[in-house]
Interface confidence: low
């Protein structure tokens, strides 16, 4: 028992005065705590705790589940403990089968013994399978068996605690190790489209894909320079054990001009963070802007060729394009094509090819274009010398 200087509060005294006690199943456990300021006994095993306000703890018929640490505490908060093993040949292990290990950390297989005098307390693979060669463990009869530095490869490993009793190997119930992967890289994030152009009242919907080793990756859509919480919906999949994918879809059902801005999909884990942005532009109505690629006043010599070229921006997409001269529409000699094959493209090119012009073919050539919201036109004045 501990000794202290006179005048200082001392820890309680426990009888029997030993750190460990072994009793047989069915026998009596009788523990006496002596202290003028006795407060309580506490019993702990695995995640269970039990309290007793009597200074004598009596269990008339001990069972294997009475194995554990009995602690007496006094009013000064000082305590003393005794560990009791209840030897039961039919129940050598107490078991908490939940077994989770964080990658690169140690984890405890919780199978404390009821008899500390059995031998060869260790781990064994299920169905006689060997354990991974690099798996290291440290047995502790009072706590269980500590697996050192859990590897990702141990995920779903089936194992038993094992002891030798009278020359025979006895196995506990089986444990399945679930490994929580450590984050060793930032999440991978991507967005369905880098920019969106919409008219007022149209729906804005954008999807961010987040990939990581586990579902505990955090992700959110944020509006740049705004704290407003955005409404998002999630879909997620586990493609195998350490390949997790989440799709976070942000929707604004009826976009307004002031919804325009940059939206960021942000994801982070314990390793770091990553983000990707998309730009939304909302216009009150559609538009067409025409840019001549040559001067709108053109001088050519008789018999020469000239190409009249315009670029134009149209949103929504152009529906009707035509070149007109003297109230007549050209059916050929011109072509119209998108400037890029990108699905976000709003820029187009139109070219009218005039060949071997005669003096009588001078005048005003007009390009007309329309979409569902607006019409636009540009005129070229051609002089043939």
């Amino acid at each position: 028992q501990p000794s202290v200087s006179p005048g200082e509060p001392s820890p309680p005294s426990i009888h029997p005065g030993k750190s460990d006690l072994i009793v047989r199943v069915g026998d009596e456990i009788r523990l006496l705590c002596t202290d003028p300021g006795f407060v309580k006994w506490t019993f702990e095993i695995l995640d269970e705790t039990n309290e007793n306000k009597q200074n004598e703890w009596i269990t008339e018929k001990a069972e294997a589940t009475n194995t554990g640490k009995y602690t007496c505490t006094n009013k000064h908060g000082l305590s003393n403990s005794i560990y009791v093993f209840v030897r039961d040949p039919a129940k050598l292990f107490l078991v908490d089968r939940s077994l989770y290990g964080k990658e690169d950390n140690d984890t405890l297989v919780r199978c404390p013994l009821t008899d500390p005098e059995v031998t060869n307390y260790s781990l064994k693979g299920c169905q006689g399978k060997p354990l991974p060669k690099d798996l290291r463990f440290i047995p502790d009869p009072k706590a269980g068996i500590m697996i050192k530095s859990v590897k990702r490869a141990y995920h779903r490993l089936c194992l038993h605690c094992s002891v030798d009793q009278e020359g025979k190997s006895v196995l506990s119930e089986k444990f399945i190790l679930k490994v929580r992967p450590a984050f060793k890289a930032v999440p991978v994030v991507s967005v369905s489209k880098a920019s969106y152009l919409l008219r007022e009242g149209e729906e804005f919907t954008v999807t961010c894909t987040i990939k990581d080793v586990s579902s505990s990756v955090y992700s959110t859509w944020k509006r740049e320079n705004s704290q407003t919480k955005l409404q998002e919906k999630y879909n997620s999949w586990h493609h195998g054990d350490f390949n997790y994918e989440r799709q976070a879809t942000l929707t604004i059902s009826s976009a307004r001009v002031n919804d325009s801005g940059v939206f960021m999909c942000y994801a982070n884990n314990t390793f770091g963070s990553a983000n990707v942005t998309t730009t939304l532009e909302v216009v009150d109505k559609g538009f067409i802007n025409i840019f001549p690629m040559i001067n709108t006043t053109v001088f050519v010599n008789d018999g020469e060729n000239v190409d009249l070229i315009v670029e134009y921006e149209a949103f929504p997409k152009p529906e009707h394009q035509q070149w007109i001269y003297m109230n007549r529409t050209f059916t050929d000699k011109w072509e119209d094509y998108p400037k890029s094959e990108n699905e976000s493209n709003i820029r187009y090119v139109s070219e009218l090819h005039l060949t071997r012009l005669k003096g009588t073919e001078g005048g005003t050539y007009t390009f007309l274009v329309s979409n569902s919201d607006v019409n636009a036109a540009i005129a070229f004045n051609v002089y043939v010398n």
Partner: nanobody
Framework: QVHLVESGGGLVQAGGSLGLSCAAS????????MGWFRQAPGKEREFVAA????????LYADSVKGRFTISRDNGENTVYLQMNSLKPEDTAVYYC??????????????????????WGQGTLVTVSS
Amino acid sequence: QVHLVESGGGLVQAGGSLGLSCAASGHTFSNYAMGWFRQAPGKEREFVAAISWSGGSTLYADSVKGRFTISRDNGENTVYLQMNSLKPEDTAVYYCALDSTGVYGTGYVSSRKGRYEYWGQGTLVTVSS
């Protein structure tokens, strides 16, 4: 995906009270036990209190028993920690945590840190003497 956000921390005089809240999103909150832990500077993170999925079972660290009360509102996806008779030694960052390893619908609560898979970022409680 689980996201836990604590709030309610701050500076309080010894003997005063403070209420912490933890809002959970992204999980069927009502299926799981929840816990509060705390970490004082330079010390290990320690268990404070836990509550079962239904609120029927609670567990407290000896150091807070009788002073702190844990409760939950499954409709609001929120767990609370009411702290009364605060002492300077209660100064710490308080974390809320979700135990997704427990069996759905059991009254199980645990003080063991390793059982809790999801953690909030923490809220600082300072008790001045």
